[in-house]
């Protein structure tokens, strides 16, 4: 959570300065048009002002920058590059600003940027080099430790002819720049699957939020290398069962808390291992709330209350006995 300041300590620019662009470096106490600034809190807020581009005259002291609720559309390369650079900028919130394109190097020249929130932008075009800044196979490490990408999926008719999951993952993995990332939020993005290599290349993750997606299975996902992972949010997906390999990997993580609420668990013979695990594990939070969705006869049964006799699979009839 980024620090903010009370409104009374903010200075506002006069509206008539809206189109002014300073050719000189900004004065230390200058505040961009349509923004509120607090030098004491090192915070600039340009919120719900329908801005179409990032203000050029941001004060050099800015540590927390809120550019939410605008109409930025495109974030070009070097969108925050300034002379002198915004060396203090640590937290940048661009949520809900109608961004549909983030270009390569959009966040270059921000040496202290630790938190970035791009949530609630329909990102049809997220460059693979948006966060790494270059197309080198190994880029300079990004200072980012927290990347919030909740609800960045564009409407279906605006998506490029490629996998949205693939586009996001390419940006996360480019140049191995995000090796220091500790928090990654990817909630509400209609993800159908998680590419198997993504987690292996983000070894510092402490918090991973994949809630409210459409994940059906974790069979090909490995959590083994995420030895620092503290919370894994998988609520509100389409998970049917967790298999032994996944259960063992989760159980072995030293700091983990797992959230599994509101998935359509299929309570048939394939669920037996997971039920056995749930009865003994302490890593699943609120495990007593997990219920079956299928088959119909099992709907709303609590997983923790099931025994092996409840978990059967209908026998597959030989073709000669099958009826049409």
């Amino acid at each position: 959570s980024s620090p903010t300041s009370s409104a009374s300590s903010f200075s506002s620019s006069a509206p008539f300065l809206a189109s002014a662009v300073s050719a000189q470096p900004p004065l230390p106490d200058q505040c961009p048009a349509l923004c509120e600034c607090s030098e004491a809190a090192r915070t600039v807020k340009c919120v719900n002002r329908n801005l179409t581009e990032v203000p050029t005259d941001l004060p050099a002291y800015v540590r927390n920058l809120f550019l939410t609720g605008n109409q930025l559309a495109v974030l070009p390369a070097g969108a925050f590059a300034r002379r002198p650079p915004l060396a203090e900028l640590a937290a940048l919130n661009l949520s809900g600003s109608r961004l549909d394109e983030v270009r390569a190097g959009a966040f270059e020249h921000l040496p202290s940027l630790r938190q970035l929130d791009l949530s609630h932008n329909p990102l049809a075009d997220l460059s693979p080099f948006a966060f790494s800044g270059s197309n080198a196979s190994v880029s300079a490490p990004s200072p980012l430790v927290e990347l919030i990408l909740n609800h960045i999926v564009p409407p279906e008719d605006e998506r490029q002819n490629r996998s949205f999951e693939g586009m996001v993952v390419a940006a996360l993995l480019a140049g191995r720049a995000l090796q220091g990332l500790r928090r990654l939020e990817l909630a509400s993005n209609h993800f159908l699957y998680l590419p198997r290599d993504v987690l292996a290349q983000l070894p510092s993750l402490r918090h991973l939020d994949l809630s409210n997606n459409s994940l059906v299975s974790l069979t090909y996902v490995s959590f083994r290398n995420l030895t620092h992972l503290e919370s894994l949010h998988l609520e509100d997906n389409a998970l049917k069962v967790l298999h032994n390999g996944t259960l063992a990997e989760l159980q072995g993580l030293p700091h983990i808390r797992v959230f599994l609420d509101n998935n359509p668990w299929v309570c048939d013979c394939h669920m037996a291992d997971m039920v056995t695990w749930l009865k003994e594990t302490e890593v699943v939070q609120g495990k007593d709330r997990l219920t079956c969705a299928y088959p119909e006869k099992m709907r709303n049964r609590v997983l923790l209350e099931l025994n092996s006799a409840d978990l059967d699979c209908d026998p597959i009839l030989p073709p000669s006995l099958q009826t049409s």
Epitope: Q251, H255, R257, W277, T281, E282, V283, Q285, G286
Partner: antibody, heavy 122, light 111 residues
Framework: EVQLVESGGGLIQPGGSLRLSCAAS????????MSWVRQPPGKGLEWVGF??????????ENSASVKGRFTISRDNSKSTLYLQMNSLRAEDTAVYYC?????????????WGQGTLVTVSS | DIVLTQSPLSLPVTPGEPASISCRAS??????????LQWYLQKPGQSPQLLIY???NVESGVPDRFSGSGSGTDFTLKISRVEAEDIGVYFC?????????FGGGTKVEIK
């Protein structure tokens, strides 16, 4: 920096009651299971019980030797763990340690307090 | 309850020499591929400090001369080269099942 500081120990008569406190700091208290472990003078360690975290409803588990007599609770607004000890016996004499369970509680306790001595004697 | 038996009860050591302590469980402490067995050191007048968790993971800040091995029911704590500061009582603990239980302890002292 994680810190656990116990208090409330002392001399108490058999059959009496005592409440131990453990003030926690340096971590998000509600995320963690917390426990009490005791050590009679010159002896080994004995697990007393634990209380689960917010995600698991702050439910408790106790060892058989204290069940029905000792109650573990927590005040999350004060980041404090408690051990209410009733019907105390001579064999409850021990140093009582408060300890934090690791994020995955199956890996047991990673931080311990300095302990508080409870002596049950007439 | 799972009973943990430690041996030896007492271990006189020479600084610079290796040392080894055994812990045997009355039943397996493994659960989904991980053995939930910890080792603690209690130095004189201090509270216990975690050395090893999950049978073989060395806790952050613990010198790398300490190592743990084993699975199922048989576990070993090794000190590659004992130092004077390593004296104290070593306890193993299982957290596979409630109630969690501790071994009786091994007292390590300088010869």
């Amino acid at each position: 920096e994680v810190q656990l500081v116990e208090s409330g120990g002392g001399l108490i008569q058999p059959g009496g009651s005592l409440r131990l406190s453990c003030a926690a700091s340096g971590f998000t208290f509600t995320d963690y299971y917390m426990s009490w472990v005791r050590q009679p003078p010159g002896k080994g360690l004995e697990w007393v019980g634990f209380i689960r975290n917010k995600g698991n409803g702050y439910t408790t588990e106790n060892s058989a030797s204290v069940k029905g007599r000792f109650t573990i609770s927590r005040d999350n607004s004060k980041s404090t763990l408690y051990l209410q000890m009733n019907s105390l016996r001579a064999e409850d004499t021990a140093v009582y340690y408060c300890a934090r369970y690791r994020g995955n509680p199956h890996y047991a306790m990673d931080y311990w307090g300095q302990g508080t001595l409870v002596t049950v004697s007439s | 309850d799972i009973v943990l038996t430690q041996s030896p009860l007492s271990l006189p050591v020479t600084p610079g020499e290796p040392a080894s302590i055994s812990c045997r469980a009355s039943e397996s402490v493994e659960f989904y591929g991980t053995s939930f067995l910890q080792w603690y050191l209690q130095k004189p007048g201090q509270s216990p400090q975690l050395l090893i968790y999950g049978a073989s993971n060395v806790e952050s800040g613990v010198p790398d001369r300490f190592s743990g091995s084993g699975s199922g029911t048989d576990f070993t704590l090794k000190i590659s080269r004992v130092e004077a500061e390593d004296i104290g009582v070593y306890f193993c603990q299982q957290s596979r099942k409630v109630p969690s239980t501790f071994g009786g302890g091994t007292k390590v002292e300088i010869k």
